[in-house]
């Protein structure tokens, strides 16, 4: 028996369902009574789901997994993972044993889009050219860790005096806070871009300083 999985990682959004595809080629006359199917975490061998002795043995992994029972006899051993969490990320091995056996691993990459950044300024009044200001760009609830880029109004990258921190919450999602310290010109626009490297999703925020009032 030869087991086949997708070579590319499966990308799944947090709280959505994901399908880890796995297939094998059943011989003529194959019956499910012959099938021994195991899904396990590759790095720990923790059992995720199994089908043995002609029946689905169910989920051994937080009761969020399911097979496609009607398709098993055709060689479809794919696994459905419901309500994906950050902690589900990793490699899963599909092991099929009939007379002989084979296995293959598929990677699950979890992702969550970042929110539109909010911009804050400190100080936020009585601003004059030559003042040092701190601009904070905050974006929330994304995964994996973001890449943050700052630019001025002419699109020139601002790399000096940038401090970025990323903190994971209890669900493993990241809140990003990036701080730019800059000396004000007569006027100017400062924009931050928060990029999710897996989703290739960009979230933009900007602040324009033209004397009073400020424009966000």
């Amino acid at each position: 028996v030869e087991v086949q999985v997708s070579e590319d990682p499966v990308v799944a959004l947090v709280d959505t369902d994901a399908t880890l595809r796995c297939s094998f080629s059943p011989e003529p006359g194959f019956s499910l009574a012959q099938l021994n199917l195991i899904w396990q975490l590759t790095d720990t061998k923790q059992l995720v789901h199994s089908f043995t002795e002609g029946r689905d043995q169910g989920s051994a992994y937080s009761n969020r997994t399911a097979l496609f029972p009607d398709l098993l006899v055709q060689g479809n051993a794919s696994l459905r993972l419901q309500r994906v969490r950050v902690t589900d990320e990793g490699s899963y091995t599909c092991f099929v044993s009939i007379q002989d056996f084979d296995s293959a691993a598929v990677s699950l990459q979890v992702a969550a889009p970042y929110s539109k950044p909010s911009m804050t300024l400190e100080p936020n009044k009585d601003l004059r050219p030559g003042n040092m200001v701190t601009i904070t760009c905050s974006s929330y609830q994304g995964y994996p860790e973001a890449e943050v880029f700052w630019k001025d109004g002419q699109g020139v990258p601002l790399t000096g005096n940038v401090t970025t921190s990323q903190m994971a919450n209890e669900r493993g999602l990241f809140d990003v806070h990036s701080v730019l310290r800059v000396v004000l010109g007569a006027n100017g626009t400062y924009s931050c871009l928060v990029r999710n490297p897996v989703l290739q999703q960009d979230a933009h925020g900007s602040v324009t300083i033209t004397g009073q009032p400020l424009t966000f």
Epitope: D43, T44, K45, T52, Q57, S97, F101, S103
Partner: antibody
Framework: EVQLLESGGGLVQPGGSLRLSCAAS????????MSWVRQAPGKGLEWVAG????????YYADSVKGRFTISRDNSKNTLYLQMNSLRAEDTAVYYC???????????WGQGTTVTVSS | QSVLTQPPSASGTPGQRVTISCSGS????????VNWYQQLPGTAPKLLIS??QRPSGVPDRFSGSKSGTSASLAITGLQSEDEADYYC???????????FGGGTKLTVL
Amino acid sequence: EVQLLESGGGLVQPGGSLRLSCAASGFTFSSYWMSWVRQAPGKGLEWVAGINRNGGTTYYADSVKGRFTISRDNSKNTLYLQMNSLRAEDTAVYYCARWNDYDIMDVWGQGTTVTVSS
Amino acid sequence: QSVLTQPPSASGTPGQRVTISCSGSSSNIGRRTVNWYQQLPGTAPKLLISNSQRPSGVPDRFSGSKSGTSASLAITGLQSEDEADYYCASWDDSLNTWVFGGGTKLTVL
């Protein structure tokens, strides 16, 4: 040729320590889980410990938990077993074994003898 | 006491067929590969059979089968050089340990 070669066995007093090594050759060491299995004189085989490819996951038999540590150095193609607080009942031949993706220990070393005695 | 149960001894005359059984549970043999090892006196164990698959170099006189939570090793055309200890083993995904049978000493009469 696929080969595993254990070393480091010897005579040690109860309560003492010993470190066993297993040098792998002829295959991509970092692609396999690895195990230690032992056999006391005149007894059967007993699995001791196992480790995954990158060393991030380790499992132990209850009889050695907290006393033995399995580790690996993929750059040196070497598996280790650090044995502390040794007891007379740890006296055995210790084998290292390659553990493949199908849950088969398919290649074994020739073994190294550990004797715990005062 | 071993997690996998196999008879302590078996015997047969040259040319005969002998079988050795191995009984486990759903968390090991029931869903995991069952392996058979031959250990000749004074040597390291050697892989003989995995489920019903023989590694290259193992004579086809040796065969394995698995049904539910039990497995068996059959040797046909018994030869004097088959005299050895035979062990069954499987990964147990509830215990997260490898489990072995106590071993069966095969005597060729």
